[in-house]
Interface confidence: medium
């Protein structure tokens, strides 16, 4: 339904508070370097303008598109060229090219200072002094660091952030109450950002068909009792929501997400028996809850899959009549029967099925040709199962930190050209698959592990895309979305890599390491490990373990010393010399 004024329509639908929050998120995700105060000023101007349009939809400029209105506003920033360089050229373009230009300049790794958490009393004072500004600052800081964060979900995070401060700033022990909640929000926020980043990459790099296939598989696993037509409707709506959010259309996205939640709750009887509790919650909680809802039970007595997709003489006829619908039905039927498979595995099976039909439906005897198609699935299913079994065994043997180190070595040898911070970040996250998924029973391990790995490897892909240094990474990232993980798993040691020159400075440590948190200290040690492998890619596991054990002992010894700095200087030289000898550096 067409509205005379799109901005008035969204303002009325969302309400002033959500409207302002979403515009702030949108602006911060586009202009990631702009000061907070500048963004607040722009948001207030847009809000005042929106109010004039609500009062009179025929008022001047109220008929303009949101992209035009927001783009015009962003292009008024005085320091655009000095701060953003060539992004300023976007302002010379017309819509829709201007918005596309802004989107292309979103930076997944902006050069922003690390967020340092102030003392609890300082935060509580700031919260009480000006709650509105405090919460806006949260939205701003998260949005600019995570330019693809799912905006309506960020509103949900902000609501929880506010609730944490409201409760804990009155508590007897403010820190004990607040800090665990903030840690949880930080960790959940990073995970949410990474999951959404994969959805946007899927849409932007591989197209709508790829995203829809992913959504069919996931929703069919989650709602196995729903009819195919119902799943298809949900997929269409969900695709629209994520296309909008990934495209910077945050007001439309939040509005459509609310509509989708409403539809799901109104039709839960034909969707899933697990939605009841979610649907009793307020909007933001409801949408979050639906997105995380557990899989419904599989219907009893599902008919034979083979009958329609292998044994039927009409397979080629049905396929030719509507290829994507037939493949969608195959994916739906397979996924609803297999909550134990990862979504990416289901998509690989559907791709194999499609390839077989393409070949067989042109053959002399199509039925004879595709009769054994399920046999082709066997190696595809075995591969992730075996990989997960081996890696969970390794994780259980080593524990998370040492498991991360094993992955650091493995991935540095595969792609040594990738920057050390990226290798550390990605390998640490890959290593978290152990504690996240290995505790699950067999039936839940693969969907947990492989779909999580897809999210983490996408982080590698988007960070590498910004500064490409490895053809092997580019190849694994761009050839096939569903085969990224098998592609990286299959990479062996890069024999073409010329080892990095030894630089003693890289391995020089100071007393400041002693005051770091356990996590930060681990990152320091893991950074050294990556550099070690880059210098000596042929080093054995045993050699690297010996050097790392020596390094850990060195840090422990010097942190206990009276004169820490002297200890680090003197013992550090000895350690470097011993390591060089051990590794032949």
């Amino acid at each position: 339904d067409a509205h005379k004024s799109e901005v008035a329509h969204r303002f009325k639908d969302l309400g002033e508070e959500n409207f302002k929050a979403l515009v702030l998120i949108a602006f911060a995700q586009y202009l990631q370097q702009c000061p907070f105060e500048d963004h607040v000023k722009l948001v207030n101007e847009v809000t005042e303008f929106a109010k004039t349009c609500v009062a009179d939809e025929s008022a001047e400029n109220c008929d303009k598109s949101l992209h035009t209105l927001f783009g015009d506003k962003l292009c008024t920033v005085a320091t655009l060229r000095e701060t953003y360089g060539e992004m300023a050229d976007c302002c010379a373009k017309q819509e829709p090219e201007r918005n596309e230009c802004f989107l292309q300049h979103k930076d997944d790794n902006p050069n922003l200072p690390r967020l340092v958490r102030p003392e609890v009393d300082v935060m509580c004072t700031a919260f009480h002094d000006n709650e509105e500004t405090f919460l806006k600052k949260y939205l701003y800081e998260i949005a600019r660091r995570h330019p693809y964060f799912y905006a309506p979900e960020l509103l949900f995070f902000a609501k929880r952030y506010k609730a944490a401060f409201t409760e804990c700033c009155q508590a007897a022990d403010k820190a004990a109450c607040l800090l665990p909640k903030l840690d949880e929000l930080r960790d959940e926020g990073k995970a949410s950002s990474a999951k959404q980043r994969l959805k946007c990459a899927s849409l932007q790099k591989f197209g709508e068909r790829a995203f829809k296939a992913w959504a069919v598989a996931r929703l069919s696993q989650r709602f196995p009792k729903a009819e195919f037509a119902e799943v298809s409707k949900l997929v269409t709506d969900l695709t629209k929501v994520h296309t909008e959010c990934c495209h910077g259309d945050l007001l439309e996205c939040a509005d459509d997400r609310a509509d989708l939640a409403k539809y799901i709750c109104e039709n839960q009887d034909s969707i899933s028996s697990k939605l009841k509790e979610c649907c009793e919650k307020p909007l933001l909680e409801k949408s979050h809850c639906i997105a995380e809802v557990e899989n419904d039970e599989m219907p009893a007595d599902l008919p034979s899959l083979a009958a329609d997709f292998v044994e039927s003489k009409d397979v080629c006829k049905n396929y030719a009549e509507a290829k994507d619908v037939f493949l969608g039905m195959f994916l739906y039927e397979y996924a609803r029967r297999h909550p134990d498979y990862s979504v990416v595995l289901l998509l690989r099976l559907a791709k194999t099925y499609e390839t077989t039909l393409e070949k067989c439906c042109a053959a002399a005897d199509p039925h004879e040709c595709y009769a054994k198609v399920f046999d082709e699935f066997k190696p595809l299913v075995e591969e992730p199962q075996n990989l997960i079994k081996q890696n969970c065994e390794l994780f259980e043997q080593l524990g998370e930190y040492k498991f991360q180190n094993a992955l650091l070595v493995r991935y540095t040898k595969k792609v040594p050209q990738v920057s050390t911070p990226t290798l550390v970040e990605v390998s640490r996250n890959l290593g978290k698959v152990g504690s996240k998924c290995c505790k699950h029973p067999e039936a839940k391990r693969m969907p947990c592990a492989e779909d999580y790995l897809s999210v983490v490897l996408n982080q590698l892909c988007v960070l590498h895309e910004k500064t490409p240094v490895s053809d092997r990474v580019t190849k694994c990232c761009t050839e096939s979305l569903v085969n990224r993980r098998p592609c990286f798993s299959a990479l062996e040691v890069d024999e073409t890599y010329v080892p990095k020159e030894f630089n003693a400075e890289t391995f020089t440590f100071h007393a400041d390491i002693c005051t770091l948190s356990e996590k930060e200290r681990q990152i320091k040690k893991q950074t050294a490990l990556v550099e070690l492998v880059k210098h000596k890619p042929k080093a054995t596991k045993e050699q690297l373990k010996a050097v790392m054990d020596d390094f850990a002992a060195f840090v422990e010894k010097c942190c206990k010393a009276d004169d820490k700095e002297t200890c680090f200087a003197e013992e550090g030289k000895k350690l470097v010399a011993a390591s060089q000898a051990a590794l032949g550096l």
């Epitope: 009958a307 044994e311 699935f377 299913v381 199962q385």
Partner: nanobody, 123 residues
């Protein structure tokens, strides 16, 4: 080599129970759907029940629903058919058969078959 071996058949009174086992050797059942068929003297082969490789999807002939239960233990490489409230007309040779991943609609689509085990329901 690849083999399926049924066991657990025998003579049982009407209303009684039996538990049939289908053990695989030479291959792992993890990637196979297992079906039970039966053939009464002078009758056609009839599908009784099937369980997909994941164990999630199970199918039963209308005549046995609520009385028969199919289950699998992949660690033991074995599939079971628990038969309760047996009727005289269910006297037959019971066979198990395997096909990759999913249950099939036709007996001819199964790749591997056992030799069968005799079930006799009589007083």
């Amino acid at each position: 080599q690849v083999q399926l071996q049924e066991s657990g058949g025998g003579l049982v009174q009407p209303g009684g129970s039996l538990r049939l086992s289908c053990a695989a050797s030479g291959f792992t059942l993890d990637y196979y759907a297992i079906a039970w068929f039966r053939q009464a003297p002078g009758k056609d082969l009839e599908g009784v029940s099937c369980i997909a490789s994941s164990g999630g999807a199970t199918n039963y002939a209308d005549s046995v629903k609520g009385r028969f239960t199919i289950s699998r233990d992949n660690a033991k490489n074995t599939v079971y058919l628990q038969m309760n409230k047996l009727k005289p007309e269910e006297t037959a040779v019971y066979y198990c058969a395997a096909a990759t991943f999913e249950c099939r609609g036709r007996s001819s689509s199964y790749d591997y078959w056992g030799q069968g085990t005799q079930v006799t329901v009589s007083s």
